[in-house]
């Protein structure tokens, strides 16, 4: 079996001219391509892998929401030679998300890493952004975490920082097959320089205080762990990402939604014009996005990231 091979961090690596072909080893009978895209209110980027895979042919598309950070995961596996170039891996990072000047800053200020390398997203090096409320959601917390994609025996990871809805989340994550977006939240200006070692204590949770043993016998009490609240299952939908309206504690599990996406199968690589209307994929890549549009998920076009200005 021969497959296309590339690794993309942000929008580099699977660029049009950098595509390779590889012969798969014995026993490998699928080509794989996987793309994970992350969108903050200040921009969007993707990580992607193409190569020889394992498992069975098929498709998997998911939309995930981690405290207002939106993630889209797509996996496509196929068993024909060089069949793994159907997903659109070439995302366009947002300049700002829509017309950002139209949004009123809400006072929160965070470091922002959108498609930046680990070297450029260290400590206080990345750019600082003003948070704002979008689509009726309040973004007053800051996030520091990572997106990781594993496919075709390759793992790619990029840092993610930006404004989120939660101010206290600790080591929260959302996952798809081979895909993880995880990190922690904080409150305060530029508080997300490094939350890798954040513990579960937060200003809203009183610390555990050791009291001297009582002099008189008293019934023992057990403190309820504030992070063990149960979460309400998110409804499955075929067209949109929906946040449950049920009230939640700050440490409820993030919600994962399986999305049924109609695929465009007519766009085969052999013959035909070379990449009309897009690059390294079929249809245009995701375009400039406004967060007010974010509830929309595309119904066709290779399960692309939702776009305001498609091709």
């Amino acid at each position: 079996l021969e497959c296309y091979s590339c690794v993309q961090k942000a929008d580099d690596g699977c660029s049009p001219h950098r595509m390779k072909t590889v012969k798969c080893g014995p026993g490998v009978d699928v080509c794989t391509e996987a793309v994970g895209a992350v969108e903050t209110i200040h921009g969007q980027f993707s990580v992607a892998v193409r190569g020889c895979g394992s498992g069975i042919p098929g498709k998997n598309d998911r939309g995930l929401d981690l405290h207002g950070l939106l993630a889209f995961f797509q996996l496509q596996q196929c068993s024909e030679d060089r069949c793994n170039a159907k997903l659109n891996l070439t995302l366009r990072g947002l300049n700002p998300a829509g017309n950002e000047s139209a949004y009123e800053p809400n006072g929160a200020e965070c470091y922002s890493c959108v498609g930046l390398s680990r070297e450029k997203c260290q400590g206080s090096m990345p750019p600082v952004v003003n948070c704002y409320n979008a689509s009726g959601r309040v973004y007053k917390g800051c996030f520091d975490g990572n997106v990781t994609l594993t496919a075709a025996n390759v793992t790619v990871s990029l840092p993610v920082r930006g404004c989120v809805q939660d101010e206290t989340c600790t080591r929260d994550g959302v996952t798809g097959p081979g895909f993880t977006l995880s990190g922690s939240c904080c409150q305060g200006p530029r508080c997300n320089a490094d939350l890798r070692n954040k513990t579960y204590f937060s200003p809203r949770i009183p610390p555990l205080v050791l009291l001297p043993p009582p002099t008189t016998a008293a019934p023992s009490t057990r403190a309820q762990n504030s992070s063990s609240t149960t979460s309400t299952a998110a409804p499955t939908t075929t067209t949109s990402i929906i946040k449950p309206t049920t009230a939640q504690a700050s440490h409820t599990s993030p919600h994962e939604m399986d999305l049924e996406v109609i695929q465009e199968e007519g766009a085969s690589l052999s013959g035909g014009a070379a990449g009309h209307g897009g690059t390294a994929g079929h249809g245009g890549a995701a375009g400039h996005q406004d967060r007010s549009n974010m509830e929309k998920y595309p119904g066709k076009g290779g399960a692309q990231i939702p776009a305001k200005g498609g091709s």
């Epitope: 660029s15 300049n95 690589l269 200005g309």
Partner: antibody, heavy 117, light 112 residues
Amino acid sequence: EVQLLESGGGLVQPGGSLRLSCAASGFTFSNAWMSWVRQAPGKGLEWVSYISSSGSTIYYADSVKGRFTISRDNSKNTLYLQMNSLRAEDTAVYYCAREGLWAFDYWGQGTLVTVSS
Amino acid sequence: ESVLTQPPSVSGAPGQRVTISCTGSSSNIGAGYVVHWYQQLPGTAPKLLIYDNNKRPSGVPDRFSGSKSGTSASLAISGLRSEDEADYYCAAWDDRLNGPVFGGGTKLTVLG
């Protein structure tokens, strides 16, 4: 119909500057990687520079690094090449080209840059 | 000197088959990068002829075919016609130069 139209070429003295433009139409420009490729008179093709759809990833050929700057304005569907410290060996027809499936699938008609005293 | 090596010229009579070779190295074709071929008719801009080693854009006749093996690639043109007289360039990504590289070009002359 996809169209790429270069402009801005002309005669310039060594050490001078020029700014080339490439107006794109007929496709979603903001989704496409774009390149500049040049061809000296009677010679072969030489890739000059390469820019991602967002403008965040850029490559240059060694021969122009530090002197040329590629940029794009997606709101105007326009690709640019700012050329400084021009040399006689930069004399060429400059083409802008769109990246398709791992290849330059559309080319402009070219604009001639002549560097001479 | 070009990173990809092509013969400066080839020729053939109408109806014949000619091949143009393109030899690279371990940093480009040999690294697995796909190869593309461009046709440049006299006085015009280049046009994509073959992409991804052996695929034809719509509108390109099946008389044109591409192949790749190891560090080399080749373009074959069968049933030569006078309108095929042009310069032909191969191209591929090069890891060392971190950009696409072209062959020096091959001038095809259709005899007669």
